[in-house]
Amino acid sequence: CDLPQTHSLGNRRALILLAQMGRISHFSCLKDRHDFGFPEEEFDGHQFQKAQAISVLHEMIQQTFNLFSTEDSSAAWEQSLLEKFSTELYQQLNDLEACVIQEVGVEETPLMNEDSILAVRKYFQRITLYLTEKKYSPCAWEVVRAEIMRSLSFSTNLQKRLRRKD
């Protein structure tokens, strides 16, 4: 399955929008910094096939979309930027979904890498618990915004590598 060229443009737009969403100086939130243990090994693109990588990417974008679709998120960010960001993520989900569906229909496609899906889910669990613990404070959201920029960058890089494999 080939992701459309517009998909990589959407990736970049999402990153730009997320950068623009920053409201407070990252430096004023240094005390709130946290290591969420991003599962880098799931995004190096070496240890599994394209079909499995796309499932992991889908999980990553879906969890990001869900995180920024909560009421707490709506209260934290400027509404029009948040809506544009969510729209970009939604479009990416549609592209990835079409690819996964195509792979599901292929009998010889290897099984989904369950542990990779779980690793992504656990990563977002850590982010969710951090926000809950910090009572969704502005600084907590800023730390999370910076973290998601990092994770989306990893996703973008993995997608580039997958395109080069084709």
Epitope: N66, V104, D115, Q125, T128, T132
Partner: antibody
Framework: QVQLQQPGAELVKPGASVKLSCKAS????????MHWVKQRPGQGLEWIGE????????IYNENFKSKATLTVDKSSITAFMQLSSLTSEDSAVYFC????????????WGQGTLVTVSA | QIVLTQSPAIMSASPGEKVTLTCSAG???????LYWYQQKPGSSPKLWIY???NLASGVPARFSGSGSGTSYSLTISSMEAEDAASYFC?????????FGSGTKLEIK
């Protein structure tokens, strides 16, 4: 509000199959994995597996791989679980439960469908 | 798979009594992925405690959860009649996800 609707009961004969349904409402169906859980009368809970309604990918408990098949119909926002080659061991209440994170993990359950396998 | 063993299987407590239910894991479980559910007869399970120690919405403050590694517990500081139910621990730290066999808590 989030709701998962399941039929109350199904009576089936040994060796037959049954397809259980779980109709979702109050949230975007394709955004969350749907899980299925088995509970035998007076017993604990067993996780059967999960399905992502967005693309249909499934993850199963090895113990249920040859017993259960999970599917979804996005148009009717319904998740299904087919149970095959039924025996008395399959007589149980089957719940669907929505995935999520933090305080939303299995925070929403269907009422459960009682499956009775009897000749 | 990670086996969760709950003890005792059944217990009864008087109103006002302190109650502790335990959940022992066959191998280590990260505390972030250890949950507790309450179930009353004829009803579906209800999320009660998430990530070891966080009370779900609407759960009375007399409940608390603690633990790490292979040993977890749910405590009721002062038993009330409405607390009579079955309690299940659950882990989603690794596949397949598992539940404990449950503790049925009765009121004396």
């Amino acid at each position: 509000q989030v709701q998962l609707q399941q039929p109350g009961a199904e009576l089936v004969k040994p060796g037959a199959s049954v397809k259980l349904s779980c109709k979702a409402s109050g949230y975007t169906f394709t955004n969350y994995w749907m899980h299925w859980v088995k509970q035998r009368p007076g017993q604990g809970l067993e996780w059967i597996g999960e399905i992502n309604p967005s693309h249909g990918r499934t993850i199963y408990n090895e113990n249920f791989k040859s017993k259960a098949t999970l599917t979804v119909d996005k148009s009717s926002i319904t998740a299904f679980m087919q149970l095959s080659s039924l025996t008395s061991e399959d007589s149980a209440v089957y719940f669907c439960a929505r995935g999520g994170l933090g305080p939303a993990w299995f925070a929403y359950w269907g009422q459960g469908t009682l499956v009775t396998v009897s000749a | 798979q990670i086996v969760l063993t709950q003890s005792p299987a059944i217990m009864s407590a008087s109103p006002g009594e302190k109650v502790t239910l335990t959940c022992s894991a066959g191998s280590s479980v990260d505390s972030s992925y250890l949950y507790w559910y309450q179930q009353k007869p004829g009803s579906s399970p209800k999320l009660w405690i998430y990530s070891t120690s966080n009370l779900a919405s609407g759960v009375p403050a007399r409940f608390s959860g603690s633990g790490s590694g292979t040993s977890y517990s749910l405590t009721i500081s002062s038993m009330e009649a409405e607390d009579a139910a079955s309690y299940f621990c659950h882990q989603w730290s690794s596949y397949p996800f598992t539940f404990g066999s449950g503790t049925k808590l009765e009121i004396k």
